[in-house]
């Protein structure tokens, strides 16, 4: 015999104190699929989120979140604090990377510089806070009368001092 | 895509009426629906709303003086014992879109209703 | 209930002035505003949703702001055509009271 419920569709649910016909989800609340025997509760998009998608009969509410913070875990689960390029988010907030380290985003940590030499190249730009080095051909590969090309640093200055 | 109400007339008081808000070029299975009135030289007054997925909310006040009902194309109200105070320009608009939270940008011209013994 | 209050009940400005139009909500409704211009004779027209966004052909002199229960619309560079009766509409369907689609009381525009 066939389940009365198959036959409600997204939108409602299976009622079961109304001899199983279909009942429609009442405000702030959807079903996203046939045959549900309850609506789920809507996500309330409060706090540091803010509400990207509404939420209707059919499909739950989308969150992301409000300038100055970014999404984390499946569904934007938590909101994040932004730091600047150049930083990482640690216990004490947003410190600045360390000498030999960058960070181009503003969420992540920050990573090291590519050692060009691991293969077998040289320091075209000088890397920053910010920005990553720019390995350059190795000075072998440089025949004679071939003038070298300079690229500007990004960021100004080829370097900093660790702090 | 437009919206139009139907129905307005003279009535005596405590005799039913129905209202029709019939609808084209949309379906009414993906918009909300909202019964607004004005009674004359007054402010705007929320009477109920139909969702897309057919529930219907009244607003407080209505306590069973407005009914609201829904086909596939049109959007019923009906005033079940009107009274003077019932006179009044009603309108039918449509949603923006079919979330709970949502806005009305399509409306009717309205349709008038004389309540008077 | 959510109770919508609106000030001033009427205003009057000249061509080209400005003209600000405040809505209290009775309770926090996020930005959950819509507002309304109506002509005699004429349905409402939407002017603003969500408290602040534009809607379609909408002139930039209108101009929406506030978030919670306190929201203002604001018309620069009046032009005689902005006279007219000004609602402001919550649409925060899911409030306590369940009653999320009240008007305040209006606001007529006279221009000079």
């Known amino acids: 015999l066939q389940d009365p419920c198959s036959n409600c569709p997204a939108g409602t649910f299976c009622d079961n104190n109304r001899n199983q016909i279909c009942s429609p989800c009442p405000p702030n609340s959807f079903s996203s699929a046939g045959g549900q025997r309850t609506c789920d509760i809507c996500r309330q998009c409060k706090g540091v989120f803010r509400t990207r998608k509404e939420c209707s009969s059919t499909s739950n509410a989308e969150c992301d979140c409000t300038p100055g913070f970014h999404c984390l875990g499946a569904g934007c689960s938590m909101c994040e604090q932004d730091c600047k390029q150049g930083q990482e988010l640690t216990k004490k907030g947003c410190k600045d990377c360390c000498f030999g380290t960058f960070n181009d985003q503003k969420r992540g940590i920050c990573r090291p510089w590519t050692n060009c030499s691991l293969d077998g190249k040289s320091v075209l730009v000088n890397g920053t806070k910010e920005r990553d080095v720019v390995c350059g051909p190795s000075p072998t590969d440089f025949s004679p009368g071939t003038p070298s090309t300079t690229m500007p640093v990004p960021g100004g200055e080829p370097g900093h001092t660790s702090h | 895509q437009s919206v139009e109400e139907s129905g307005g007339r003279l009535v005596t008081p405590g005799t039913p009426l129905t209202l029709t808000c019939t609808v084209s070029?949309?379906?009414?299975?993906?918009?909300?629906m909202i019964w607004v009135r004005q009674a004359p030289g007054k402010g705007l007054e929320w009477i109920g709303v139909?969702?897309?997925?057919?529930y219907i909310s009244h607003a407080t006040w209505v306590k069973g003086r407005f009914t609201i009902s829904k086909t596939s194309t049109t959007v019923g109200l009906e005033i079940t014992s009107p009274t003077t105070e019932d006179t009044a320009t009603y309108f039918c608009?449509?949603?923006?879109?079919?979330?709970?939270?949502?806005?009305?940008?399509?409306w009717g011209q309205g349709t008038l209703v004389t309540v008077s013994s | 209930d959510i109770v919508m209050t609106q000030t001033p009940a009427s205003v009057e400005a000249a061509v080209g002035g400005t003209v600000t139009i405040k809505c209290q909500a009775s309770e926090s409704i996020s930005n959950y505003l819509a507002w309304y211009q109506q002509k005699p004779g004429q349905p409402p027209k939407l002017l603003i949703y969500?408290?602040?966004t534009l809607a379609s052909g909408v002139s930039s002199r209108f101009k929406g702001s506030g978030s919670g229960t306190e929201f203002t619309l604001t018309i620069s560079d009046l032009e005689s055509a902005d006279a007219a009766t000004y609602y402001c509409?919550?649409?925060?369907?899911?409030?306590?009271?369940?009653?999320?689609?009240?008007f305040g009381g209006g606001t007529e525009v006279v221009v000079k």
């Open positions: 139909v969702y897309d997925n057919g």
């Open positions: 509409q919550t649409n925060y369907c899911c409030s306590s009271s369940d009653n999320g689609f009240a």
């Open positions: 608009a449509r949603s923006a879109d079919g979330s709970w939270s949502t806005y009305f940008n399509l």
């Open positions: 070029g949309f379906s009414l299975s993906t918009y909300a």
């Open positions: 969500k408290a602040s």
